[in-house]
């Protein structure tokens, strides 16, 4: 028996369902009574789901997994993972044993889009050219860790005096806070871009300083 999985990682959004595809080629006359199917975490061998002795043995992994029972006899051993969490990320091995056996691993990459950044300024009044200001760009609830880029109004990258921190919450999602310290010109626009490297999703925020009032 030869087991086949997708070579590319499966990308799944947090709280959505994901399908880890796995297939094998059943011989003529194959019956499910012959099938021994195991899904396990590759790095720990923790059992995720199994089908043995002609029946689905169910989920051994937080009761969020399911097979496609009607398709098993055709060689479809794919696994459905419901309500994906950050902690589900990793490699899963599909092991099929009939007379002989084979296995293959598929990677699950979890992702969550970042929110539109909010911009804050400190100080936020009585601003004059030559003042040092701190601009904070905050974006929330994304995964994996973001890449943050700052630019001025002419699109020139601002790399000096940038401090970025990323903190994971209890669900493993990241809140990003990036701080730019800059000396004000007569006027100017400062924009931050928060990029999710897996989703290739960009979230933009900007602040324009033209004397009073400020424009966000």
């Amino acid at each position: 028996v030869e087991v086949q999985v997708s070579e590319d990682p499966v990308v799944a959004l947090v709280d959505t369902d994901a399908t880890l595809r796995c297939s094998f080629s059943p011989e003529p006359g194959f019956s499910l009574a012959q099938l021994n199917l195991i899904w396990q975490l590759t790095d720990t061998k923790q059992l995720v789901h199994s089908f043995t002795e002609g029946r689905d043995q169910g989920s051994a992994y937080s009761n969020r997994t399911a097979l496609f029972p009607d398709l098993l006899v055709q060689g479809n051993a794919s696994l459905r993972l419901q309500r994906v969490r950050v902690t589900d990320e990793g490699s899963y091995t599909c092991f099929v044993s009939i007379q002989d056996f084979d296995s293959a691993a598929v990677s699950l990459q979890v992702a969550a889009p970042y929110s539109k950044p909010s911009m804050t300024l400190e100080p936020n009044k009585d601003l004059r050219p030559g003042n040092m200001v701190t601009i904070t760009c905050s974006s929330y609830q994304g995964y994996p860790e973001a890449e943050v880029f700052w630019k001025d109004g002419q699109g020139v990258p601002l790399t000096g005096n940038v401090t970025t921190s990323q903190m994971a919450n209890e669900r493993g999602l990241f809140d990003v806070h990036s701080v730019l310290r800059v000396v004000l010109g007569a006027n100017g626009t400062y924009s931050c871009l928060v990029r999710n490297p897996v989703l290739q999703q960009d979230a933009h925020g900007s602040v324009t300083i033209t004397g009073q009032p400020l424009t966000f």
Epitope: N36, I38, K45, L47, F95, Q99
Partner: antibody, heavy 118, light 109 residues
């Protein structure tokens, strides 16, 4: 040729320590889980410990938990077993074994003898 | 006491067929590969059979089968050089340990 070669066995007093090594050759060491299995004189085989490819996951038999540590150095193609607080009942031949993706220990070393005695 | 149960001894005359059984549970043999090892006196164990698959170099006189939570090793055309200890083993995904049978000493009469 696929080969595993254990070393480091010897005579040690109860309560003492010993470190066993297993040098792998002829295959991509970092692609396999690895195990230690032992056999006391005149007894059967007993699995001791196992480790995954990158060393991030380790499992132990209850009889050695907290006393033995399995580790690996993929750059040196070497598996280790650090044995502390040794007891007379740890006296055995210790084998290292390659553990493949199908849950088969398919290649074994020739073994190294550990004797715990005062 | 071993997690996998196999008879302590078996015997047969040259040319005969002998079988050795191995009984486990759903968390090991029931869903995991069952392996058979031959250990000749004074040597390291050697892989003989995995489920019903023989590694290259193992004579086809040796065969394995698995049904539910039990497995068996059959040797046909018994030869004097088959005299050895035979062990069954499987990964147990509830215990997260490898489990072995106590071993069966095969005597060729």
């Amino acid at each position: 040729e696929v080969q595993l070669l254990e070393s480091g066995g010897g005579l040690v007093q109860p309560g003492g320590s010993l470190r066993l090594s297993c040098a792998a050759s002829g295959f991509t060491f970092s692609s396999y889980w690895m195990s230690w299995v032992r056999q006391a004189p005149g007894k059967g085989l007993e699995w001791v410990a196992g480790i995954n490819r990158n060393g991030g996951t380790t499992y132990y038999a209850d009889s050695v938990k907290g006393r033995f540590t399995i580790s690996r150095d993929n750059s040196k193609n070497t598996l280790y077993l650090q044995m502390n607080s040794l007891r007379a009942e740890d006296t055995a031949v210790y084998y290292c074994a390659r553990w493949n993706d199908y849950d088969i220990m398919d290649v074994w070393g020739q073994g190294t003898t550990v004797t715990v005695s005062s | 006491q071993s997690v996998l149960t196999q008879p302590p001894s078996a015997s047969g005359t040259p040319g005969q067929r002998v079988t050795i059984s191995c009984s486990g549970s759903s968390s090991n043999i029931g869903r995991r590969t069952v392996n058979w090892y031959q250990q000749l006196p004074g040597t390291a164990p050697k892989l003989l059979i995995s489920n019903s698959q023989r590694p290259s170099g193992v004579p086809d006189r040796f065969s394995g089968s698995k049904s539910g939570t039990s497995a068996s090793l059959a040797i046909t055309g018994l030869q004097s050089e088959d005299e050895a200890d035979y062990y069954c083993a499987s990964w147990d995904d509830s215990l997260n340990t490898w489990v072995f049978g106590g071993g069966t000493k095969l005597t060729v009469l």
